[in-house]
């Protein structure tokens, strides 16, 4: 009689998560009479995995009804695979007995389970950085198997190469991780520009996992300032006027100070949105020149978005004006917040006339 | 460890109908094979029939086709025998065994069910 | 259907002696390479016992006094040396088709 043979005829069997794999093993004989069994792993570790004779495996079926007259085949189908079933498995035959007695073994199956990676998550710094900085993006994918895995990055489509990526773990494991940081350069540009952490798969079929991070949540463009003073008017009135260009994001305010002392102070809100994403916005004082004996040095304190404030003075020569009596008013409060005066929108140099 | 344990010992009219329960143990019931087998008093084995429990498929001796029905249950491991239109000479120990090795034979049996059959 | 024929009825061997017993098919029960014959011992008020399957395989636990041999349609078991506790009846059984059983063959010490 020739020896029995248990056939494992696939070394590896590589299958998606979620599908059944079916695990196919043979024998070559029905001498000796005795169950089969399969086990996950080798040695006195192993699980098992099913027992034709025994037990109650609800995601193992026999592939053959094992009733059938003289049946030799002991495949067996796991349904809804997960990561976590990845491994090798061996078809072990045991000899009828009290207890059964294992015989031998087949050469063991490998199962690769394909699982796909999450959504990339893209997160940027915690704190806004400004215009002409660098800042660091970082893109995380977890649960994907097997380990190889392409990341690139983008910017406004433009593949970005100050990029550090990792897999983990390094060695074996069910499924794996992968975390990537790009080092991003911000210019007064990038308002609507938007970073792209792309991930590519043997799983996704060539259709590649994106996540994305708006600029938008990371940039701060510093507004440029400029006070200028209007013609002076019949009742001996000036417009100065302070323009504030080019700055995001919106949170700003404003303080007029006249020879030191504040005036008044505006908080910018529900601004126009220039072609760029940034804003601008016009703010003026009226000054009475007659009331006042001395020159005025009027000065425009802009506060962005948390940032030290940023000053621009302009000083009002009232020597030239004669006085009006009956006048105690040294400047009006009027007119001074006009949020529809900002027609500018992105016409880059109408409004950069520095006066120093 | 294999057990088949039988219900016991039944007296029975001619005409009248005898159900044997056979309650499997320590193996999966729905994978292996129950067979029949009946022994008349100092007489031989003769087989009666065969049930997959996963299934219900049945095979007969043709001698008793018509008068018996082999039955499982599955949620309790059972298989059941019924003889109908008891003869004297249906007289007999009842035996279940099961085929461990899908060979039909009987590696395991139980202990016997013996029926009388007498007016 | 197949018959089995058992020869003979009833045989009586000295302790430590050979015992030999034959099964004739009416026809081949042999398949595919294999052997569907099947030797049962069966000792007073006890349900039978697998000896043999296939032929010639033992069961496990079978002392390895008990052996089969034979092919196609002829078929022995033997007891090379026969025990006091041997004493039974001895059938054997196909399953080449639905199975049936030999009509047995009584073995005591002579």
């Known amino acids: 009689e020739e020896e029995l043979q248990v056939i494992q005829p696939e070394k590896s069997v590589s299958v998606a998560a979620g599908d059944s794999a079916t695990l196919n093993c043979t024998v070559s004989s029905l001498i000796p009479v005795g169950p089969i069994q399969w086990f996950r792993g080798a040695g006195p570790g192993r699980e098992l995995i099913y027992n034709l004779k025994e037990g109650h495996f609800p995601r193992v079926t026999a592939v053959s009804d094992p009733t059938k007259r003289n049946n030799m085949d002991f495949s067996i189908r796991i349904s809804n695979i997960t990561p976590a079933d990845a491994g090798t498995y061996y078809c072990v035959k045991f000899r009828k007995g009290s207890p059964d007695v294992e015989l031998k073994s087949g050469a063991g199956t490998e199962l690769s389970v394909r699982a796909k990676p999450s959504a990339p998550v893209v997160s940027g710094p915690a704190v806004r950085a400004t215009a002409e900085h660098t800042v660091s993006f970082t893109c995380e994918s977890h649960g994907f198997s097997p380990r190889d895995i392409t990341l690139k990055w983008f910017k406004n489509g433009n593949e970005l190469s100050d990029v550090q990526t990792n897999v983990d773990p390094a060695g074996k494991s069910v499924s794996y991780s992968i975390r990537s940081t790009a080092r991003v350069l911000l210019t007064r540009r990038d308002v609507h520009s938007q970073v792209i952490c792309e991930v590519a798969h043997v799983t996704l079929q060539g259709d590649p996992l994106r996540g994305t991070a708006n600029l938008s949540e990371a940039i701060r463009v510093p507004p440029f300032l400029e006070v200028t003073q209007q013609s002076m008017r019949a009742d001996n009135q000036v417009n100065v006027t302070c323009q504030v260009t080019k700055f995001y994001p919106q949170r700003l305010q404003l303080t007029w100070l006249e020879n030191g002392n504040v005036s008044r102070t505006e908080m910018a809100s529900a601004l126009p949105e220039n072609k760029d994403g940034t804003y601008n916005w016009t703010s003026w004082l009226l000054v009475n020149v007659s009331a006042h004996r001395d020159d005025v040095k009027l000065t425009c304190q802009v506060e962005h978005d948390g940032q030290p404030a940023v000053n621009k003075s302009f000083s009002v020569k009232v020597s030239a004006h004669p006085k009006e009596q009956g006048s105690n008013t040294a400047a009006e409060n009027t007119g001074t917040n006009e949020r529809g005066s900002s027609d500018y929108k992105d016409d880059d140099d109408k409004h950069h006339h520095h006066h120093h | 460890q294999v057990q088949l344990v039988q219900s016991g010992a039944e007296v029975k009219k001619p005409g009248a109908s005898v159900k044997v329960s056979c309650k499997a143990s320590?193996?999966?019931?729905?994978?292996?094979?129950i067979n029949w087998v009946r022994q008349a008093p100092g007489q031989g084995l003769e087989w009666i029939a065969m049930?997959?429990?996963?299934?219900?498929?049945?095979h007969y001796n043709q001698i008793f086709k018509d008068r018996a029905t082999l039955t499982t249950d599955t949620s309790t491991s059972t298989a059941y025998m019924e003889l109908r239109s008891l003869r004297s000479d249906d007289t007999a120990v009842y035996y279940c065994a099961m085929d461990y090795g899908s060979l039909y034979a009987m590696d395991y049996w139980g202990r016997g069910t013996l029926v009388t059959v007498s007016s | 259907d197949i018959v089995l024929t058992q020869s003979p009825d009833s045989l009586a061997v000295s302790l430590g002696e050979r015992a030999t017993i034959n099964c004739r098919a009416s026809?081949?029960?042999?398949?595919?390479?294999?052997?569907?014959i099947f030797w049962y011992q069966q000792k007073p008020g006890q349900p039978p016992k697998l000896l043999i399957y296939?032929?010639?395989n033992l069961d496990p636990g079978v002392p390895d006094r008990f052996s089969g041999s034979g092919s196609g349609t002829d078929f022995t078991l033997t007891i090379s040396s026969l025990q006091a506790e041997d004493v039974a009846v001895y059938y054997c059984?196909?399953?080449?088709?639905?199975?049936?059983f030999g009509q047995g063959t009584k073995l005591e010490i002579k």
């Open positions: 049930i997959d429990p996963s299934d219900s498929e049945t």
């Open positions: 320590g193996y999966t019931f729905t994978n292996y094979w």
């Open positions: 026809k081949s029960v042999s398949s595919s390479g294999y052997n569907y």
């Open positions: 059984q196909h399953s080449r088709e639905l199975p049936t």
């Open positions: 296939l032929a010639s």
